[in-house]
């Protein structure tokens, strides 16, 4: 016996109670493929969620987070509160990064400043709560007579042109 359900297109469900007739999905539900015996209830973007894409008879709604929140998880399954740069979200809310750490985004955790000396470099620009340190050349590179892969252009002396 041929399964008539395979003839039911997306946007419908195959109603076994009615000799496998294809019935349209009711409002706020959808079926994204043909041959389905049920329709899926549409996702509702409420509270901290806002609708990015309306539900249709063949596709689910898609949600974003309202201002001040950002999406987490697959298909924006959760919204997490934004913090300022230089902060991280804790159970007690947004807290400033501890000294020696930074966060340059509105989400995520504070991360330790780069340790320039591990790469044999020196700190060119100090770190802040919002920005990582900037590492510069190693102290040895800055000492007179140190060889460099790209030697600096000679400094001009007053009244002299470079050789």
């Amino acid at each position: 016996l041929q399964d008539l359900c395979s003839n039911c297109p997306a946007g419908t469900f195959c109603d076994n109670n009615r000799s496998q007739i294809c019935s349209p999905c009711p409002p706020n539900s959808f079926s994204s493929a043909g041959g389905q015996r049920t329709c899926d209830i549409c996702r509702q973007c409420k509270g901290v969620f806002k609708t990015r894409k309306e539900c249709s008879s063949t596709s689910n709604a898609e949600c974003d987070c309202i201002s001040g929140y950002h999406c987490l998880g697959a298909e924006c399954s959760m919204c997490e509160q934004d913090c300022k740069q230089g902060q991280e979200l804790t159970k007690k809310g947004c807290k400033d990064c501890c000294f020696g750490t930074f966060n340059d985004q509105k989400r995520g955790i504070c991360r330790p400043w780069t340790n320039c000396s591990l790469d044999g470099k020196s700190v060119l620009v100090n770190g802040t709560k919002e920005r990582d340190v900037v590492c510069g050349p190693s102290p040895a590179d800055l000492s007179p007579g140190a060889s460099s892969a790209t030697p600096p252009a000679p400094a001009r002396e007053p009244g002299h042109s470079p050789q």
């Epitope: 076994n16 009711p26 409002p27 539900s29 049920t38 329709c39 209830i41 409420k46």
Partner: nanobody, 120 residues
Framework: EVQLVESGGGLVQPGGSLRLSCAAS????????VGWFRQAPGKEREYVGT??????HYGDFENNRFTISRDNAKNTVYLQMNNLRPEDTAVYYC???????????????QGQGTQVTVSS
């Protein structure tokens, strides 16, 4: 934790009517289709119907004797049963799912059930 509580069951004479209620706590019905099932002693569980977004779908046995409706304000779904017959005697369960209809679906949550007995 979602809890579904059925009420309104009891003993009724053949030809009589009952209205069963299903109330949800811990979550509203807003995001769920609500279904009714029944199970008679020694028999398989039987699909009664599903309600979603103003639409109701019914099992093939009920012949327009049963009607499912919903009161949004009370967060309650009803099963109105008219012209009851002895073969309608069963425990009636309310359930919720993200699928419509629930004829072929295992519900996400189900209540404890309410007994309906049709007898003279």
């Amino acid at each position: 934790e979602v809890q579904l509580v059925e009420s309104g069951g009891g003993l009724v004479q053949p030809g009589g009517s009952l209205r069963l209620s299903c109330a949800a706590s811990g979550r509203t019905f807003d995001n769920y289709a609500v279904g009714w099932f029944r199970q008679a002693p020694g028999k398989e569980r039987e699909y009664v119907g599903t309600y979603w977004s103003g639409y109701a779908h019914y099992g093939d046995f009920e012949n327009n004797r049963f009607t499912i409706s919903r009161d949004n304000a009370k967060n309650t779904v009803y099963l109105q049963m008219n012209n009851l017959r002895p073969e309608d005697t069963a425990v009636y369960y309310c359930a919720i799912s993200l699928k419509y209809p629930m004829a072929t679906v295992t519900p996400d949550y189900q209540g404890q059930g309410t007994q309906v007995t049709v007898s003279s």
